[in-house]
Amino acid sequence: RDCAEVFKSGHTTNGIYTLTFPNSTEEIKAYCDMEAGGGGWTIIQRREDGSVDFQRTWKEYKVGFGNPSGEYWLGNEFVSQLTNQQRYVLKIHLKDWEGNEAYSLYEHFYLSSEELNYRIHLKGLTGTAGKISSISQPGNDFSTKDGDNDKCICKCSQMLTGGWWFDACGPSNLNGMYYPQRQNTNKFNGIKWYYWKGSGYSLKATTMMIRPADF
C-alpha cells in the first residue's frame, strides 16, 4: 500500500500516512503529496533546511530516518520492495537559492534488492533539470559511509557525504551536506544536481517522489 492507494481510497489531503510493505503487515510512515501533478505521490526523500544529518549508515538508509513532515529518507528496503511489485515513475523536484525550480521525471524506476546493493534502475528522462541524467546511467549500487560500493578508488560517500548511487563519483548527490544561502556555491560536497546547476552549487530544497506508472 502506497500513497497512490491511499489517494484512491479517498484521502486526498497532503500529509503523513501509514503505508505497509508489500505482502506484509510491516508498516512505515511516509509523507504523501496528494496535490502535485494529480496526487498519489509517495515522498521518498526531502531536503529543505539542513535539520537532519544525512551522513548515515547503510542500516539507517535501509530502514529510513528523519521526520516525514520535514527532512527524511523513507528507506531503501521499502522502496525496493514497492518498486519491484509494479512499474513506478520517479519525479525529482529541485529548488535553487534564486527562486528557480526544476524537475526530472523518469518513466521507469526501481531499486534492486539489498543483496544487489539497492542498485538504481532508471529509464525515460524528461523534465527541466537537464537533458542528461544527473543520476549516472546505467544505474549504480547504493553507497554509504560504511558501505562503499561506488566505482571510485576513493570513497565517494566519505568525500561527498551522504548515501547515494555514486559512480566515480558522478554528477549528483541529493544527500550531501546542506549549505545555507550565500554559503552554497563552490561547495564540493553539497546537494548537487550537475546537469541543472553545474559544479559546486548546493541546492536549497529537493524532493524525490514515486508513483505507479499506471496511476
Partner: antibody
Framework: QVQLVQSGVEVKKPGASVKVSCKTS????????FSWVRQAPGQGLEWLGW????????NYAQKFQGRVTMTTDTSTSTAYMELRTLRSDDTAVYYC??????????????WGQGTLVTVAS | DIQMTQSPSSVSASVGDRVIITCRAS??????LAWYQQKPGTAPKLLIH???SLQTGVPSRFSGSGSGTEFALTINSLQPEDFGTYYC?????????FGGGTRVEIK
Amino acid sequence: QVQLVQSGVEVKKPGASVKVSCKTSGYTFSNNGFSWVRQAPGQGLEWLGWISGYNGNTNYAQKFQGRVTMTTDTSTSTAYMELRTLRSDDTAVYYCARDQDYSNFHWLDPWGQGTLVTVAS
Amino acid sequence: DIQMTQSPSSVSASVGDRVIITCRASQGLSSWLAWYQQKPGTAPKLLIHSASSLQTGVPSRFSGSGSGTEFALTINSLQPEDFGTYYCQQANSFPLTFGGGTRVEIK
C-alpha cells in the same frame, strides 16, 4: 586517449594582453572543468582560476580578478585564458589542466604541455 | 584561502631509499588532497588523489596517507626516474592552492 594541446610561445610587451588556447580531445568536454595554472621560472605552481566545460561558470583567484578571463568553445572543445595588462612578473609557463567537474573533483589530470609567455619591453 | 605548507623543501636520497614528503593544510581538508610529480621542462603529473588513491598507471611504490590537515607522500624504494619536484594541492575549496614543492634529488 585524453589530450590537451596548448597554443605556442608568446612574447608580449608590458601592458598588452595574451590569449592562450587549450584544445581538448578524447573525452566528453561538458563533463569536465579546466584550471589554469602558471609557473614562473624556477618557481612553484600558482592557480589562476577555473572554468566549467558544462556551463561556463568561472572562479578566479583573487589576485587575478579583473585581469583574467576564461572562456570555452564547446563546438571546438577548446578552453581559453586571456590575461590583460601584462607585467614583467607575468612571465611564466601557463598550463591548462582538466578536472572531473561533474564529480566536483578538482584534481588535475591531464595537463597541457604548457605555453611560455614572456613579457618584456 | 587555504595555505599548504610542504616539507622538506628539498631532499637528496639514494636509490632504494624511502622518501617521505609531508604537507600541512591551514584548515581541514577531509581527504581532498592530491600529489603531483613534475620533471624539469614538463607539465606536472597526477600521482595520487583523494589523499591516498593511486592514479591509474602510477607505480605502487608511491603511496599517500593522511586526512584533515596532515598528509604525506611516501616513495618506497626510490628509483632513478623519481627525481623531480613534488607538489601537494588541496581540492577542498576554491581557490585551489598548491604547496611550495619538494625537490627530490638522487644521490
